[in-house]
Amino acid sequence: TTPEPCELDDEDFRCVCNFSEPQPDWSEAFQCVSAVEVEIHAGGLNLEPFLKRVDADADPRQYADTVKALRVRRLTVGAAQVPAQLLVGALRVLAYSRLKELTLEDLKITGTMPPLPLEATGLALSSLRLRNVSWATGRSWLAELQQWLKPGLKVLSIAQAHSPAFSCEQVRAFPALTSLDLSDNPGLGERGLMAALCPHKFPAIQNLALRNTGMETPTGVCAALAAAGVQPHSLDLSHNSLRATVNPSAPRCMWSSALNSLNLSFAGLEQVPKGLPAKLRVLDLSCNRLNRAPQPDELPEVDNLTLDGNPFLVPGTALPHEGSMNSGVVPAC
């Protein structure tokens, strides 16, 4: 017997569907109507034939009452080839729901997204997460998707993007966006970051995550942020192969005074990088390759410093005397 494609937990809270059959019975998903968190994985199916069975241009207001009754707050859709028209149809319907967080992963969006009709309502998401989503429209995809969203988006995460740079002139500002996560785009680099951080389009950013994005130096990131007018409070540069030294010919970059938390863990650093902000609330340098203790002018003034997992702290590596330089905590690095 083939397993049921959809499973709803005992609390009617989380429902997960894995449609792996070539001809799936999509009606199975109806058992998820009572769930708050819904995940639908389409097994890599091409949803093009779906367009023949649904009227993507139908007025979604006819479904408004039904959709409003849904409990779903978090929706994940993954592993499919989706025509842009179908995606738009879904977004139009979901605009009447109470959906707050949408995650799209391992999707190939084909075709172009039509413009938002005048009478249409945007989707009032607080969080949008995209992982390994490719768009036929190249760099203009964010601008096209944005028009289907209300301007209250707070969290935007874009990982494994095929085109992490955006067509900035087409993108409107994200006035409420406080968290931008561009992690896991190893080809981004500092120049790509400058292109992705469309100047003045992200005025409210407080948290910027750039894990595993091909960043090279904290100073280079500083320059990209300054050019874009982005002033995060928290910056995550962990899991990049960072160089500690700055190119002497490169101009010095003044970090924004707003920055108070900097994560430089797992960055392969052999010394504390030059050109860090003078004062930080949090600095994470854990799991690097620091093989000697920092001297007083090598560290900024930090309230909360993490250095665990560096060779100079590891027990058994010639400490000058007991108690010094050893936190006693050896994290798994």
Partner: antibody, heavy 125, light 108 residues
């Protein structure tokens, strides 16, 4: 074992210069910052500043920004304090002291774990 | 600049008695206070680092406490070799660092 050995007692005239040395042994000289501390006769300890032994960059306390120079010779594992245009108020015992880094669950700082025996500088005409 | 104020200037104690030395910082220094002992004609010697950590080889009768702006060095039972001058020093993360003016512990 860790040792800081300073040069001997100096007697100088006002206006002259003096150079005090501090030779480190028993550890890697460039792994620890070196500080200088002044103690005038019958007085307390006064932190003068320090030198980054990786870069050679000195940092001076406000009262020691003129006439005082910290330097080092990595190959000789030696730090130096030079005082120019000596004045009567420079008459004191000068100590070098090694800074060791302390870290434990988010808290960090430095303390002076090893001190030289001190070099007495007398300024007299 | 952070000012460290030690009290009393002189403490007269009989051998075997307890001695309590105080050190006040003019602003919050967290736990970044170290204590040093200096005997006549000798270099200072580290006793306590980061407010309460006894340095290697320092007898258990020496203990430190406090955080923020108020710090204490306690010698639980004074031995003849403990009569000396004691200095607190704030080493608040980054320089400049400053010493207190010292407390002389003398035989009563």
């Amino acid at each position: 074992q860790v040792q800081l050995v300073q040069s001997g007692h100096e007697v100088k005239q006002p206006g002259a210069s003096v150079k005090v040395s501090c030779k480190a042994s028993g550890y890697s000289f460039t792994d620890y910052a070196m500080n200088w501390v002044k103690q005038a006769p019958g007085q307390g300890l006064e932190w003068m500043g320090w030198i980054n032994t990786q870069t050679g960059k000195p940092t001076y306390a406000d009262d020691f920004k003129q006439r005082f120079v910290f330097s080092m010779d990595t190959s000789a594992s030696t730090a130096y304090l030079q005082i120019s245009s000596l004045k009567a108020e420079d008459m004191a015992m000068y100590y070098c002291a090694r800074s060791t880094f302390y870290y434990s669950s988010y808290i960090y700082g430095w303390y002076f774990d090893f001190w030289g025996q001190g070099t007495s500088v007398t300024v007299s005409s | 600049e952070i000012v460290m104020t030690q009290s009393p200037a002189t403490l007269s104690v009989s051998p075997g008695e307890r001695a309590t030395l105080s050190c006040k910082a003019s602003q919050n220094v967290g736990s970044n206070v170290d204590w040093y002992q200096q005997k006549p004609g000798q270099a200072p010697r580290l006793l306590i680092y980061k407010a309460s950590n006894r340095y290697t080889g320092i007898p258990a009768r020496f203990s430190g406490s406090g955080s923020g702006t108020e710090f204490t060095l306690t010698i639980s039972s004074l031995q003849s070799e403990d009569f000396a001058v004691y200095y607190c020093m704030q080493s608040n993360t980054n320089p400049p660092w400053t010493f207190g003016q010292g407390t002389k512990v003398e035989i009563k």
